[in-house]
Interface confidence: low
């Protein structure tokens, strides 16, 4: 999906008002020194591409993020503010239902959500120079 035509300010508002809290809740009790941010993004469409990938694509050691509150709110924000996004996700959602897994918070998931927080921070500050 090409995120170029999304309403970035509306997505930012959704993050600021709710998604950020859910990410903090998920990471509660985790020390900042545990993870290094290795995923970055260069502009807002790129950030949303990376956020979508980390949030919804199962990875080795973390298959359960899509059912978390922050993921559901992220999905809703993208569906509302990115034209045509919902249609691209129908097949992916059906595939996910078939392989639904028990929700488990693993260290790998915590690391992944830590990366997500970094991506969201970057998304919210598009004018900042790349570190």
């Amino acid at each position: 999906y090409d995120f170029t035509n999304c309403d970035f300010e509306k997505i930012k508002a959704a993050y600021l008002s709710t998604i950020s809290k859910d990410l903090i809740t998920y990471m509660s009790g985790t020390k900042s020194t545990e993870f290094n941010n290795t995923v970055s993004c260069s502009n807002r469409p790129h950030c949303l591409t990376e956020i979508q990938s980390l949030t919804f694509n199962p990875t080795a050691g973390c298959a359960s993020l899509a059912k978390e509150m922050f993921a559901m709110k992220t999905k809703a924000a993208l569906a509302i503010w990115c034209p045509g996004y919902s249609e691209t996700q129908i097949n992916a959602t059906q595939a996910m239902k078939k392989r639904r897994k028990r929700k488990v918070t693993t260290n790998k998931c915590l690391e992944q959500v830590s990366q997500l927080q970094g991506l969201w921070r970057r998304f919210n500050r598009p004018l900042l120079k790349q570190q």
Partner: nanobody
Framework: EVQLVESGGGVVQPGGSLRLSCAAS??????????IGWFRQAPGKEREGVSC????????YYADSVKGRFTISRDNSKNTVYLQMNSLRPEDTALYYC??????????????????WGQGTLVTVSS
């Protein structure tokens, strides 16, 4: 549930002092890289960033309008961030909010645009 509760506001005469507190529950300031800050909104005006503190290294930043008068600090053992406000002026009258997961740097301290999580605490400077 993640919550921030602001307190310490009140009515004070010009030149007076107040100390605002922002207490967090549902998460721990010290546990993660959360930058924490204060912003304010005066009646009929836009919200403006006042000050923030980086949880990584304790660096602090202030809006030009409060530099030298306000001091931000944190007590991780109490999970609370404070804003000590001295030499208060009538133009400091506003509803003060704290926010977490802000971007604490010179670029952004005057641009906090987070939706308020708490109810805020009202500061009125008047003779």
């Amino acid at each position: 549930e993640v919550q921030l509760v602001e307190s310490g506001g009140g009515v004070v005469q010009p030149g007076g002092s107040l100390r605002l507190s922002c207490a967090a529950s549902g998460f721990t300031f010290a546990d993660y890289d959360y930058d924490i800050g204060w912003f304010r909104q005066a009646p009929g005006k836009e919200r403006e960033g006042v000050s923030c503190i980086s949880n990584r290294d304790g660096s602090t930043y202030y809006a030009d309008s409060v530099k030298g008068r306000f001091t931000i600090s944190r007590d991780n053992s109490k999970n609370t961030v404070y804003l000590q406000m001295n030499s208060l002026r009538p133009e400091d009258t506003a509803l003060y909010y704290c926010a977490v997961e802000i971007h604490c740097d010179d670029y952004g301290v005057e641009n906090f645009d987070f939706d308020p999580w708490g109810q805020g605490t009202l500061v009125t400077v008047s003779s």
